[in-house]
């Protein structure tokens, strides 16, 4: 099993590379990986005590 691409920049991650639509670039492992969709809910109505927390749509299993 080959090691990760560490020779050029050591443990620094390279700039993100284009990934297919269902994927995104993971700086930690330096590869395109499966990604879910990030979303920010609409703000609560005026007078609500705190802003809605940011959440995400789960990745397809």
């Amino acid at each position: 099993m080959r090691r990760g691409p560490r020779s050029l920049r050591g443990r620094d991650a390279p700039a993100p590379t284009p990934c297919v639509p269902a994927e995104c670039f993971d700086l930690l492992v330096r590869h395109c990986v499966a990604c879910g969709l990030l979303r920010t809910p609409r703000p609560k109505p005026a007078g609500a005590s705190s802003p809605a927390p940011r959440t995400a749509l789960q990745p397809q299993e």
């Epitope: 099993m1 080959r2 090691r3 990760g4 691409p5 443990r11 620094d12 991650a13 993100p16 284009p18 990934c19 995104c24 670039f25 993971d26 700086l27 930690l28 492992v29 330096r30 590869h31 990986v33 499966a34 990604c35 879910g36 969709l37 990030l38 940011r54 995400a56 749509l57 990745p59 299993e61």
Partner: antibody
Framework: EVQLVESGGGLVQPGGSLRLSCAAS????????IHWVRQAPGKGLEWVAW????????DYADSVKGRFTISADTSKNTAYLQMNSLRAEDTAVYYC??????????????????WGQGTLVTVSS | DIQMTQSPSSLSASVGDRVTITCRAS??????VAWYQQKPGKAPKLLIY???FLYSGVPSRFSGSGSGTDFTLTISSLQPEDFATYYC?????????FGQGTKVEIK
């Protein structure tokens, strides 16, 4: 249901070997990275190794480099941690975990969302 | 390697209190920080990822903020089930590193 189940822990003498398994269900380990994290008794969390099964890429903590090997069998949906030349300081509960990613401007925003129950490795004579 | 320094290492609080835990990275990690909760004998649970995003199913009393080197986990109103140890973790550069933990105890 997503689940990770570790096995293979136990008591081993210094210098000995163990192979831990992490059987995944409810998702494919090919889709992301799998990590091993350990916790010595009464101590904090220490990352040990990761693997991206699709690419075969791996990395290790300096404390285990050259002694531990992480691998994966995608047909069995299982990751492994082969531990050789074990030392007393390797005594810990070993967890495997899945890293989840969400797309934030093309880059992963994520964390370790599913963890196994842990398996205890005791290195003692 | 990037060091993650949490403070305080422990704190005592009462139900209903607002609790803040901080984490400082030894170098810029952008927003690549996650927060976990761990109870004795159990595996950690993901609370917050990417510094401020609440993981699915986590109560909204938990929130995270920060960018660069300074990060905060806040529990707006501490509940009995929140007494646990909390860890920050950076995932900007391998190796991913954890803070030493903050134990939240009952006052």
């Amino acid at each position: 249901e997503v689940q990770l189940v570790e096995s293979g822990g136990g008591l081993v003498q210094p210098g000995g070997s163990l192979r831990l398994s992490c059987a995944a269900s409810g998702f494919s380990i090919s889709s992301n990275s799998i990590h091993w994290v350990r916790q010595a008794p009464g101590k904090g969390l220490e990352w040990v190794a990761w693997i991206t099964p699709t690419h075969g890429s791996t990395d290790y903590a300096d404390s285990v480099k050259g002694r531990f090997t992480i691998s994966a069998d995608t047909s069995k949906n299982t990751a492994y941690l082969q531990m050789n030349s074990l030392r007393a300081e390797d005594t810990a509960v070993y967890y495997c975990a899945r890293r989840v990613c969400y797309n934030r401007l093309g880059v992963c925003a994520g964390g370790m969302d599913y963890w196994g129950q842990g398996t205890l490795v005791t290195v003692s004579s | 390697d990037i060091q993650m320094t949490q403070s305080p290492s422990s704190l005592s609080a009462s139900v209903g209190d607002r609790v803040t835990i901080t984490c400082r990275a030894s170098q810029d990690v952008s927003t690549a920080v996650a927060w976990y909760q761990q109870k004795p004998g159990k595996a950690p649970k993901l609370l917050i990822y990417s510094a401020s995003f609440l993981y699915s199913g986590v109560p909204s009393r938990f929130s995270g903020s920060g960018s660069g080197t300074d990060f905060t986990l806040t529990i707006s109103s501490l509940q009995p089930e929140d007494f646990a140890t909390y860890y920050c973790q950076q995932s900007r550069i391998t190796p991913p590193t954890f803070g030493q933990g903050t134990k939240v105890e009952i006052k």
